[in-house]
Protein backbone atom coordinates (compact mmCIF):
# COMPACT_ATOMS: atom_id res chain seq x y z
CA UNK A 1 0.00 0.00 0.00
CA UNK A 2 1.50 3.32 -1.04
CA UNK A 3 0.92 6.85 0.22
CA UNK A 4 -0.50 5.77 3.56
CA UNK A 5 -3.53 3.93 2.15
CA UNK A 6 -4.18 0.73 4.10
CA UNK A 7 -5.87 -2.51 3.13
CA UNK A 8 -8.26 -3.78 5.80
CA UNK A 9 -7.85 -7.35 4.54
CA UNK A 10 -5.50 -9.24 6.88
CA UNK A 11 -4.59 -12.09 4.53
CA UNK A 12 -3.89 -9.74 1.64
CA UNK A 13 -1.70 -7.54 3.84
CA UNK A 14 0.18 -10.51 5.27
CA UNK A 15 0.71 -11.82 1.72
CA UNK A 16 2.17 -8.45 0.68
CA UNK A 17 4.46 -8.37 3.72
CA UNK A 18 5.69 -11.90 3.00
CA UNK A 19 6.29 -11.06 -0.67
CA UNK A 20 8.17 -7.87 0.24
CA UNK A 21 10.38 -9.58 2.81
CA UNK A 22 11.11 -12.39 0.33
CA UNK A 23 12.39 -9.81 -2.16
CA UNK A 24 14.38 -7.90 0.45
CA UNK A 25 16.34 -10.89 1.70
CA UNK A 26 17.58 -11.49 -1.86
CA UNK A 27 21.22 -10.35 -1.97
CA UNK A 28 21.10 -9.99 -5.78
CA UNK A 29 18.91 -6.90 -5.29
CA UNK A 30 21.19 -4.94 -2.98
CA UNK A 31 24.35 -6.47 -1.50
CA UNK A 32 25.68 -8.02 -4.73
CA UNK A 33 25.25 -4.83 -6.84
CA UNK A 34 26.82 -2.81 -4.02
CA UNK A 35 29.84 -5.13 -3.90
CA UNK A 36 30.31 -4.86 -7.68
CA UNK A 37 29.88 -1.08 -7.83
CA UNK A 38 32.26 -0.51 -4.92
CA UNK A 39 34.95 -2.78 -6.37
CA UNK A 40 34.74 -5.24 -3.48
CA UNK A 41 34.10 -8.24 -5.76
CA UNK A 42 37.46 -9.85 -4.98
CA UNK A 43 37.65 -12.92 -2.68
CA UNK A 44 40.07 -11.30 -0.22
CA UNK A 45 37.92 -8.17 0.06
CA UNK A 46 34.64 -10.09 0.31
CA UNK A 47 36.05 -11.86 3.37
CA UNK A 48 36.06 -8.51 5.18
CA UNK A 49 32.35 -7.98 4.47
CA UNK A 50 30.87 -9.57 7.58
CA UNK A 51 27.75 -8.55 9.46
CA UNK A 52 28.51 -6.44 12.54
CA UNK A 53 27.12 -8.22 15.62
CA UNK A 54 24.19 -6.42 17.23
CA UNK A 55 23.50 -4.14 14.28
CA UNK A 56 20.08 -5.79 13.78
CA UNK A 57 17.78 -7.70 16.14
CA UNK A 58 18.26 -11.47 15.95
CA UNK A 59 15.54 -13.88 14.82
CA UNK A 60 15.32 -15.20 18.38
CA UNK A 61 14.72 -11.67 19.68
CA UNK A 62 12.05 -11.03 17.03
CA UNK A 63 10.26 -14.29 17.81
CA UNK A 64 10.07 -13.42 21.49
CA UNK A 65 8.38 -10.07 20.96
CA UNK A 66 4.76 -10.93 20.21
CA UNK A 67 3.02 -9.46 17.19
CA UNK A 68 2.68 -5.87 18.32
CA UNK A 69 6.21 -5.66 19.70
CA UNK A 70 7.55 -7.30 16.55
CA UNK A 71 5.82 -4.74 14.31
CA UNK A 72 7.05 -1.84 16.44
CA UNK A 73 10.62 -3.15 16.35
CA UNK A 74 10.38 -3.74 12.59
CA UNK A 75 9.01 -0.22 12.02
CA UNK A 76 11.81 1.39 14.05
CA UNK A 77 14.50 -0.76 12.40
CA UNK A 78 13.23 0.07 8.90
CA UNK A 79 13.40 3.76 9.80
CA UNK A 80 17.07 3.31 10.65
CA UNK A 81 17.60 1.29 7.47
CA UNK A 82 16.20 4.18 5.39
CA UNK A 83 18.74 6.54 6.99
CA UNK A 84 21.65 4.21 6.28
CA UNK A 85 20.51 3.50 2.71
CA UNK A 86 20.23 7.22 1.97
CA UNK A 87 23.74 7.66 3.38
CA UNK A 88 25.09 4.81 1.23
CA UNK A 89 23.38 6.22 -1.87
CA UNK A 90 25.03 9.58 -1.35
CA UNK A 91 28.47 7.98 -1.59
CA UNK A 92 27.81 5.85 -4.67
CA UNK A 93 29.54 6.71 -7.95
CA UNK A 94 27.49 8.79 -10.39
CA UNK A 95 25.90 7.08 -13.39
CA UNK A 96 28.31 8.73 -15.85
CA UNK A 97 31.31 7.59 -13.79
CA UNK A 98 30.02 4.02 -13.80
CA UNK A 99 29.66 4.11 -17.58
CA UNK A 100 33.22 5.38 -17.95
CA UNK A 101 34.47 2.58 -15.71
CA UNK A 102 32.53 -0.01 -17.71
CA UNK A 103 30.40 -0.93 -14.69
CA UNK A 104 26.75 -1.95 -15.00
CA UNK A 105 24.28 0.93 -14.70
CA UNK A 106 21.59 -1.62 -13.74
CA UNK A 107 23.45 -2.23 -10.48
CA UNK A 108 23.07 1.44 -9.59
CA UNK A 109 19.37 1.34 -10.47
CA UNK A 110 18.88 -1.69 -8.20
CA UNK A 111 20.54 0.15 -5.32
CA UNK A 112 18.37 3.21 -5.92
CA UNK A 113 15.22 1.06 -5.74
CA UNK A 114 16.04 -0.16 -2.24
CA UNK A 115 14.78 2.89 -0.35
CA UNK A 116 11.35 3.13 -2.03
CA UNK A 117 10.90 -0.62 -1.51
CA UNK A 118 11.74 -0.29 2.20
CA UNK A 119 9.29 2.61 2.38
CA UNK A 120 6.57 0.40 0.87
CA UNK A 121 7.30 -2.37 3.36
CA UNK A 122 7.27 0.09 6.25
CA UNK A 123 3.89 1.41 5.15
CA UNK A 124 2.49 -2.13 5.14
CA UNK A 125 3.97 -2.74 8.60
CA UNK A 126 2.13 0.37 9.79
CA UNK A 127 -1.08 -0.89 8.13
CA UNK A 128 -0.77 -4.29 9.79
CA UNK A 129 -0.22 -2.58 13.16
CA UNK A 130 -3.42 -0.57 12.57
CA UNK A 131 -5.25 -3.78 11.71
CA UNK A 132 -4.04 -5.33 14.98
CA UNK A 133 -5.15 -2.10 16.70
CA UNK A 134 -1.70 -0.92 17.72
CA UNK A 135 -2.01 2.82 18.12
CA UNK A 136 1.53 3.40 19.43
CA UNK A 137 3.21 3.41 16.05
CA UNK A 138 4.09 6.66 14.30
CA UNK A 139 2.32 7.13 10.98
CA UNK A 140 4.97 6.66 8.28
CA UNK A 141 4.18 9.96 6.57
CA UNK A 142 4.58 12.03 9.73
CA UNK A 143 7.74 13.04 11.57
CA UNK A 144 8.22 10.76 14.56
CA UNK A 145 9.05 11.56 18.14
CA UNK A 146 12.69 11.52 17.10
CA UNK A 147 13.89 8.57 15.07
CA UNK A 148 16.06 6.21 17.11
CA UNK A 149 19.58 6.64 15.80
CA UNK A 150 21.02 3.66 13.96
CA UNK A 151 23.82 1.60 15.43
CA UNK A 152 26.25 3.28 13.06
CA UNK A 153 29.99 2.89 13.22
CA UNK A 154 31.71 6.22 13.85
CA UNK A 155 31.70 7.98 10.44
CA UNK A 156 35.07 7.55 8.80
CA UNK A 157 36.87 9.51 6.14
CA UNK A 158 38.58 6.32 4.97
CA UNK A 159 36.83 5.53 1.69
CA UNK A 160 37.68 1.83 1.77
CA UNK A 161 36.53 1.50 5.38
CA UNK A 162 33.26 3.25 4.49
CA UNK A 163 32.70 0.75 1.67
CA UNK A 164 33.30 -2.17 4.03
CA UNK A 165 30.93 -0.69 6.62
CA UNK A 166 28.29 -0.34 3.92
CA UNK A 167 28.86 -3.93 2.88
CA UNK A 168 28.57 -5.20 6.48
CA UNK A 169 25.39 -3.18 6.99
CA UNK A 170 23.78 -4.62 3.83
CA UNK A 171 24.76 -8.17 4.77
CA UNK A 172 23.11 -7.64 8.16
CA UNK A 173 20.07 -6.09 6.51
CA UNK A 174 19.53 -9.11 4.23
CA UNK A 175 19.93 -11.47 7.19
CA UNK A 176 17.46 -9.39 9.19
CA UNK A 177 14.91 -9.47 6.36
CA UNK A 178 15.34 -13.25 6.19
CA UNK A 179 14.53 -13.43 9.93
CA UNK A 180 11.54 -11.10 9.46
CA UNK A 181 10.26 -13.31 6.64
CA UNK A 182 10.52 -16.40 8.87
CA UNK A 183 8.55 -14.65 11.61
CA UNK A 184 5.81 -13.61 9.17
CA UNK A 185 5.67 -17.16 7.78
CA UNK A 186 4.54 -18.34 11.23
CA UNK A 187 1.66 -15.89 11.38
CA UNK A 188 -1.71 -17.60 11.08
CA UNK A 189 -4.58 -17.13 8.65
CA UNK A 190 -6.34 -14.62 10.90
CA UNK A 191 -5.23 -11.60 12.92
CA UNK A 192 -5.51 -13.48 16.22
CA UNK A 193 -3.93 -16.85 15.35
CA UNK A 194 -0.27 -17.80 15.02
CA UNK A 195 1.20 -21.04 13.74
CA UNK A 196 3.84 -22.46 16.07
Amino acid sequence: AAMGSCSKEYRMLLGQLQKQTDLMQDTSRLLDPYIRIQGLDIPKLREHCRESPGAFPSEETLRGLGRRGFLQTLNATLGRVLHRLADLEQHLPKAQDLERSGLNIEDLEKLQMARPNVLGLRNNVYCMAQLLDNSDMTEPTKAGRGTPQPPTPTPTSDVFQRKLEGCSFLRGYHRFMHSVGRVFSKWGESPNRSRR
Epitope: A1, M3, H83, M113, R115, N117, R122, P150
Partner: antibody, heavy 121, light 111 residues
Framework: EVQLVESGGGLVQPGGSLRLSCAAS????????MSWVRQAPGKGLEWVAT????????YYLDNVRGRFTISRDNAKNSLYLQMNSLRAEDTAVYYC??????????????WGRGTLVTVSS | DIVMTQSPDSLAVSLGERATINCRAS??????????MHWYQQKPGQPPKVLIY???NLESGVPDRFSGSGSGTDFTLTISSLQAEDVAVYYC?????????FGGGTKVEIK
Protein backbone atom coordinates in the same frame (compact mmCIF):
# COMPACT_ATOMS: atom_id res chain seq x y z
CA GLU B 1 3.39 29.14 16.28
CA VAL B 2 5.89 27.11 14.28
CA GLN B 3 8.77 29.40 13.34
CA LEU B 4 12.28 29.34 11.87
CA VAL B 5 14.48 32.43 12.07
CA GLU B 6 17.82 32.61 10.23
CA SER B 7 20.72 34.88 11.14
CA GLY B 8 24.41 35.31 10.40
CA GLY B 9 24.29 36.49 6.79
CA GLY B 10 26.33 39.41 5.52
CA LEU B 11 29.06 40.56 3.16
CA VAL B 12 32.18 38.42 2.96
CA GLN B 13 35.18 38.33 0.63
CA PRO B 14 35.85 35.37 -1.69
CA GLY B 15 37.68 32.66 0.25
CA GLY B 16 36.17 33.88 3.51
CA SER B 17 33.93 32.11 6.03
CA LEU B 18 30.52 32.68 7.54
CA ARG B 19 28.34 30.74 9.99
CA LEU B 20 24.58 30.83 9.56
CA SER B 21 22.21 29.98 12.39
CA CYS B 22 18.54 29.04 12.42
CA ALA B 23 16.50 29.25 15.63
CA ALA B 24 13.47 26.94 15.71
CA SER B 25 10.41 27.33 17.90
CA UNK B 26 6.85 26.04 18.17
CA UNK B 27 7.66 22.38 17.42
CA UNK B 28 9.79 19.51 18.73
CA UNK B 29 12.98 20.39 16.86
CA UNK B 30 14.78 17.17 17.80
CA UNK B 31 12.11 15.08 15.99
CA UNK B 32 12.74 16.60 12.56
CA UNK B 33 15.35 16.42 9.88
CA MET B 34 16.31 19.93 8.75
CA SER B 35 17.72 21.50 5.58
CA TRP B 36 19.26 24.60 4.07
CA VAL B 37 17.98 25.83 0.70
CA ARG B 38 19.37 28.86 -1.12
CA GLN B 39 18.20 31.29 -3.78
CA ALA B 40 20.60 33.47 -5.77
CA PRO B 41 19.24 36.98 -6.48
CA GLY B 42 16.54 36.78 -9.17
CA LYS B 43 17.12 33.02 -9.61
CA GLY B 44 15.47 29.74 -8.61
CA LEU B 45 15.73 27.59 -5.52
CA GLU B 46 18.63 25.22 -4.82
CA TRP B 47 18.82 22.60 -2.09
CA VAL B 48 22.14 22.86 -0.22
CA ALA B 49 22.28 20.42 2.71
CA THR B 50 20.22 18.22 5.02
CA UNK B 51 20.86 16.81 8.49
CA UNK B 52 19.06 13.97 10.28
CA UNK B 53 17.10 14.49 13.49
CA UNK B 54 19.89 13.32 15.77
CA UNK B 55 22.66 14.78 13.60
CA UNK B 56 24.19 11.41 12.64
CA UNK B 57 23.64 11.81 8.91
CA UNK B 58 24.41 14.76 6.65
CA TYR B 59 23.80 15.23 2.93
CA TYR B 60 25.27 17.93 0.67
CA LEU B 61 25.01 19.41 -2.77
CA ASP B 62 28.14 18.31 -4.66
CA ASN B 63 29.55 21.80 -5.18
CA VAL B 64 29.38 22.69 -1.47
CA ARG B 65 30.62 19.35 -0.08
CA GLY B 66 33.93 19.86 1.70
CA ARG B 67 33.33 23.63 2.02
CA PHE B 68 30.03 23.74 3.94
CA THR B 69 29.13 21.86 7.12
CA ILE B 70 25.58 21.47 8.38
CA SER B 71 25.16 20.81 12.11
CA ARG B 72 22.58 21.15 14.85
CA ASP B 73 22.25 21.58 18.60
CA ASN B 74 18.98 19.98 19.70
CA ALA B 75 19.38 21.32 23.25
CA LYS B 76 19.34 24.86 21.81
CA ASN B 77 16.75 24.16 19.07
CA SER B 78 19.29 25.47 16.56
CA LEU B 79 20.51 24.55 13.09
CA TYR B 80 23.81 25.81 11.65
CA LEU B 81 25.59 26.10 8.33
CA GLN B 82 29.33 26.72 8.49
CA MET B 83 30.45 28.07 5.12
CA ASN B 84 34.17 28.14 4.27
CA SER B 85 36.09 28.97 1.08
CA LEU B 86 33.16 31.08 -0.09
CA ARG B 87 32.82 31.89 -3.79
CA ALA B 88 30.89 34.57 -5.67
CA GLU B 89 28.43 31.91 -6.84
CA ASP B 90 27.47 31.20 -3.20
CA THR B 91 25.81 34.64 -3.06
CA ALA B 92 22.17 33.96 -2.20
CA VAL B 93 19.40 34.16 0.35
CA TYR B 94 19.81 31.09 2.57
CA TYR B 95 16.64 29.55 3.93
CA CYS B 96 16.34 27.13 6.82
CA UNK B 97 13.57 24.56 6.21
CA UNK B 98 11.90 21.75 8.12
CA UNK B 99 11.75 18.32 6.47
CA UNK B 100 8.54 16.28 6.66
CA UNK B 101 6.89 13.36 4.92
CA UNK B 102 8.26 9.94 4.12
CA UNK B 103 11.58 9.16 5.84
CA UNK B 104 14.51 10.27 3.61
CA UNK B 105 12.10 11.31 0.81
CA UNK B 106 11.25 14.57 2.53
CA UNK B 107 9.64 17.77 1.36
CA UNK B 108 9.92 21.14 3.16
CA UNK B 109 6.82 22.36 4.96
CA UNK B 110 8.11 25.24 7.11
CA TRP B 111 10.62 27.84 5.92
CA GLY B 112 12.36 30.75 7.57
CA ARG B 113 12.39 34.19 5.93
CA GLY B 114 16.00 33.74 4.89
CA THR B 115 19.32 35.52 5.46
CA LEU B 116 21.31 37.12 2.65
CA VAL B 117 24.91 36.06 2.06
CA THR B 118 26.91 38.25 -0.34
CA VAL B 119 30.35 37.08 -1.48
CA SER B 120 32.19 39.94 -3.15
CA SER B 121 35.55 41.67 -3.10
CA ASP C 1 21.56 14.38 -10.76
CA ILE C 2 17.91 14.56 -11.76
CA VAL C 3 17.18 17.69 -13.80
CA MET C 4 13.72 19.23 -13.43
CA THR C 5 12.46 21.17 -16.45
CA GLN C 6 9.46 23.42 -15.90
CA SER C 7 7.26 24.84 -18.62
CA PRO C 8 6.26 27.44 -19.49
CA ASP C 9 8.72 29.95 -18.01
CA SER C 10 5.87 32.42 -17.60
CA LEU C 11 2.13 32.32 -17.95
CA ALA C 12 -0.52 35.06 -18.22
CA VAL C 13 -4.05 33.90 -17.40
CA SER C 14 -7.32 35.79 -16.98
CA LEU C 15 -8.95 35.89 -13.55
CA GLY C 16 -11.18 32.87 -13.07
CA GLU C 17 -9.44 30.92 -15.85
CA ARG C 18 -7.40 27.72 -15.56
CA ALA C 19 -3.61 27.81 -15.26
CA THR C 20 -1.51 24.72 -15.95
CA ILE C 21 2.19 24.32 -15.16
CA ASN C 22 4.24 21.30 -16.20
CA CYS C 23 7.35 19.76 -14.75
CA ARG C 24 9.42 17.06 -16.45
CA ALA C 25 12.15 15.07 -14.68
CA SER C 26 15.20 13.76 -16.54
CA UNK C 27 14.47 10.35 -15.01
CA UNK C 28 11.57 8.86 -13.10
CA UNK C 29 10.91 10.31 -9.65
CA UNK C 30 8.30 7.62 -8.94
CA UNK C 31 9.02 4.23 -7.40
CA UNK C 32 7.20 1.48 -5.51
CA UNK C 33 3.89 3.31 -5.95
CA UNK C 34 5.19 6.63 -4.59
CA UNK C 35 5.57 9.90 -6.51
CA UNK C 36 8.35 11.99 -4.96
CA MET C 37 7.28 15.31 -6.48
CA HIS C 38 6.13 18.48 -4.72
CA TRP C 39 4.94 21.95 -5.72
CA TYR C 40 5.74 25.34 -4.13
CA GLN C 41 4.48 28.88 -4.49
CA GLN C 42 6.74 31.87 -3.87
CA LYS C 43 5.55 35.47 -3.74
CA PRO C 44 8.00 38.40 -3.98
CA GLY C 45 10.03 38.93 -0.80
CA GLN C 46 8.61 35.79 0.83
CA PRO C 47 9.91 32.25 1.40
CA PRO C 48 8.38 29.43 -0.64
CA LYS C 49 5.17 27.79 0.57
CA VAL C 50 4.27 24.14 -0.09
CA LEU C 51 1.04 23.63 -2.05
CA ILE C 52 1.11 19.98 -3.13
CA TYR C 53 3.19 17.11 -1.73
CA UNK C 54 3.82 13.68 -3.25
CA UNK C 55 2.36 14.78 -6.60
CA UNK C 56 -1.31 15.06 -5.64
CA ASN C 57 -1.77 15.72 -1.91
CA LEU C 58 -3.06 19.17 -1.00
CA GLU C 59 -1.18 20.75 1.90
CA SER C 60 -3.39 21.77 4.82
CA GLY C 61 -4.75 25.31 4.45
CA VAL C 62 -4.15 25.49 0.69
CA PRO C 63 -7.28 26.34 -1.37
CA ASP C 64 -8.69 23.39 -3.30
CA ARG C 65 -8.42 25.25 -6.61
CA PHE C 66 -4.83 23.95 -6.56
CA SER C 67 -4.33 20.35 -7.65
CA GLY C 68 -1.45 18.17 -8.75
CA SER C 69 -1.20 15.10 -10.94
CA GLY C 70 1.30 12.93 -12.77
CA SER C 71 3.76 10.11 -12.23
CA GLY C 72 7.10 8.92 -13.55
CA THR C 73 8.71 11.87 -15.29
CA ASP C 74 5.74 14.14 -16.08
CA PHE C 75 3.83 16.16 -13.51
CA THR C 76 1.28 18.99 -13.61
CA LEU C 77 0.14 21.69 -11.22
CA THR C 78 -3.30 23.10 -12.03
CA ILE C 79 -4.99 26.20 -10.68
CA SER C 80 -8.62 25.65 -11.66
CA SER C 81 -9.75 29.26 -11.30
CA LEU C 82 -6.98 31.83 -11.03
CA GLN C 83 -7.35 34.44 -8.27
CA ALA C 84 -5.43 37.71 -7.89
CA GLU C 85 -3.57 36.32 -4.87
CA ASP C 86 -2.19 33.44 -6.98
CA VAL C 87 0.23 35.76 -8.80
CA ALA C 88 3.60 34.23 -7.87
CA VAL C 89 6.43 32.02 -9.07
CA TYR C 90 5.73 28.27 -8.84
CA TYR C 91 8.43 25.62 -8.42
CA CYS C 92 8.43 21.84 -8.59
CA UNK C 93 10.79 19.84 -6.36
CA UNK C 94 11.74 16.17 -6.45
CA UNK C 95 12.92 14.22 -3.40
CA UNK C 96 13.55 10.87 -5.12
CA UNK C 97 17.28 10.95 -4.34
CA UNK C 98 19.96 13.31 -3.11
CA UNK C 99 20.51 15.95 -4.36
CA UNK C 100 16.91 17.13 -4.27
CA UNK C 101 16.45 19.51 -7.21
CA PHE C 102 13.92 22.23 -8.04
CA GLY C 103 12.53 23.21 -11.40
CA GLY C 104 13.52 26.61 -12.77
CA GLY C 105 10.19 28.19 -11.84
CA THR C 106 7.09 29.42 -13.67
CA LYS C 107 5.94 33.02 -13.22
CA VAL C 108 2.13 33.31 -13.19
CA GLU C 109 0.57 36.70 -13.94
CA ILE C 110 -2.90 38.09 -14.60
CA LYS C 111 -3.78 38.69 -18.24
Amino acid sequence: EVQLVESGGGLVQPGGSLRLSCAASGFTFSSYWMSWVRQAPGKGLEWVATISDGGSFTYYLDNVRGRFTISRDNAKNSLYLQMNSLRAEDTAVYYCARDVGHTTFWYFDVWGRGTLVTVSS
Amino acid sequence: DIVMTQSPDSLAVSLGERATINCRASKSVSAAGYNFMHWYQQKPGQPPKVLIYYASNLESGVPDRFSGSGSGTDFTLTISSLQAEDVAVYYCLHSREFPFTFGGGTKVEIK
